[in-house]
Amino acid sequence: ESGYAQNGDLEDAELDDYSFSCYSQLEVNGSQHSLTCAFEDPDVNITNLEFEICGALVEVKCLNFRKLQEIYFIETKKFLLIGKSNICVKVGEKSLTCKKIDLTTIVKPEAPFDLSVVYREGANDFVVTFNTSHLQKKYVKVLMHDVAYRQEKDENKWTHVNLSSTKLTLLQRKLQPAAMYEIKVRSIPDHYFKGFWSEWSPSYYFRTPEINNSSGEMDPI
């Protein structure tokens, strides 16, 4: 099967909305970068549709995406990482829609990991630490992190703290005593590169101590 549409198919195709969005991930697999695109309308019939990127590439004109279920994906070392590329949705040789995109402005970092919370009894605080693979990267090294925490019973009442380091101190007196808390963290590029928030890290759950009646302080767990 050639993948070329019949004339009727092309006429139908032109009536559809082929708007799409993409994000890049740099050095996501060693020195390899990735680019992921998907249609904004989940109901688009993607059977004969392909994605192609041209321009701002190293020693090639264009690269074709691999189709992975509903998403289109490239993993390569061949991004120049400067200037705009032309990303097109194609049926055979015909481009249905194209976008000029600078891959350095659509960077989505990898999710932080190893989130943990340690209670310090003497200091009456909680030390939140997490890790990010970006500390070892050549390009997207500088990130802004968003730590979000909530009391488990408060469904949508998240408190957010932005920070550039991977360590945060939460004062015990700012938290409810004898309560279960959920905490998570995500990252966004913060220098030279621009883009989107990463996925959230897996949540970490911790309990605050009871209040010690004599001192008015919380009991450690």
Epitope: C54, G55, K61, L80, L81, I82, G83, K100, Y139
Partner: antibody, heavy 119, light 105 residues
Framework: QVQLVQSGAEVKKPGASVKVSCKAS????????MNWVRQAPGQGLEWMGL????????SYNQKFKGRVTLTRDTSISTAYMELSRLRSDDTAVYYC????????????WGQGTTVTVSS | EIVLTQSPATLSLSPGERATLSCSAS?????MHWYQQKPGQAPRPLIY???KLASGIPARFSGSGSGTDFTLTISSLEPEDFAVYYC????????FGGGTKVEIK
């Protein structure tokens, strides 16, 4: 104003190497590719390669790969083109040219450096 | 690799006349650029992305075309327009055409 100033003319013997410099001013050096284009006497233009000054990533015309090396020094906003194993048919004017990152045309050019290869 | 063929190689015209320069690609090109070069000078951009005028270029210059056939038009030649004109493909390996020399008749 935006300007690219190249090093002076060179005369080299066959088999030698030449290194041409291109000093940029009036814009953010790391924000645009630097391209190298040559023109043999009475001939047309030939793209040799480019460098991304931000990260040093290069892209070469296959015709020159292995003989041309593009480098840059961001601290002095200068790009370099080194051509090795020179032959008489490398006699040409060598231009550096800034690459526009949106439309990929060469929007600012250096004045050119004449390289003469002669025994 | 795409080959860009410019025609004619030489165009002999008088000031005030209309000049039509062609650039034919061996396979389809998304965008084409045009440059002007005078003797002893570096090229300068005229038209980018088929039809957009580069900075400081007068409106008598225009570009058109798509696919494999592109045209640069100078509506009324001025004395300073007599020069060599090159088309160039927007993508790697940024190939140039062989040039068209516009000379005074």
């Amino acid at each position: 104003q935006v300007q690219l100033v190249q090093s002076g003319a060179e005369v080299k013997k066959p088999g030698a190497s030449v290194k041409v410099s291109c000093k940029a001013s009036g814009y953010t050096f790391t924000g645009y590719t630097m391209n190298w284009v040559r023109q043999a006497p009475g001939q047309g233009l030939e793209w040799m390669g480019l460098i991304n000054p931000y990260n040093g990533v290069t892209s070469y015309n296959q015709k020159f790969k292995g003989r041309v090396t593009l480098t840059r020094d961001t601290s002095i906003s200068t790009a370099y083109m080194e051509l090795s194993r020179l032959r008489s048919d490398d006699t040409a004017v060598y231009y550096c040219a800034r690459g526009d990152g949106e439309y990929w045309y060469f929007d600012v050019w250096g004045q050119g450096t004449t390289v003469t290869v002669s025994s | 690799e795409i080959v860009l063929t410019q025609s004619p190689a030489t165009l002999s015209l008088s000031p005030g006349e209309r000049a039509t320069l062609s650039c034919s690609a061996s396979s389809s090109v998304t965008y084409m650029h045009w440059y002007q070069q005078k003797p002893g000078q570096a090229p300068r951009p005229l038209i980018y992305e088929i039809s957009k005028l580069a900075s400081g270029i007068p409106a008598r210059f225009s570009g058109s075309g798509s696919g494999t056939d592109f045209t640069l038009t100078i509506s009324s030649l001025e004395p300073e327009d007599f020069a060599v004109y090159y088309c160039q493909e927007w993508n790697y390996p940024y190939t140039f055409g062989g040039g068209t020399k516009v000379e005074i008749k």
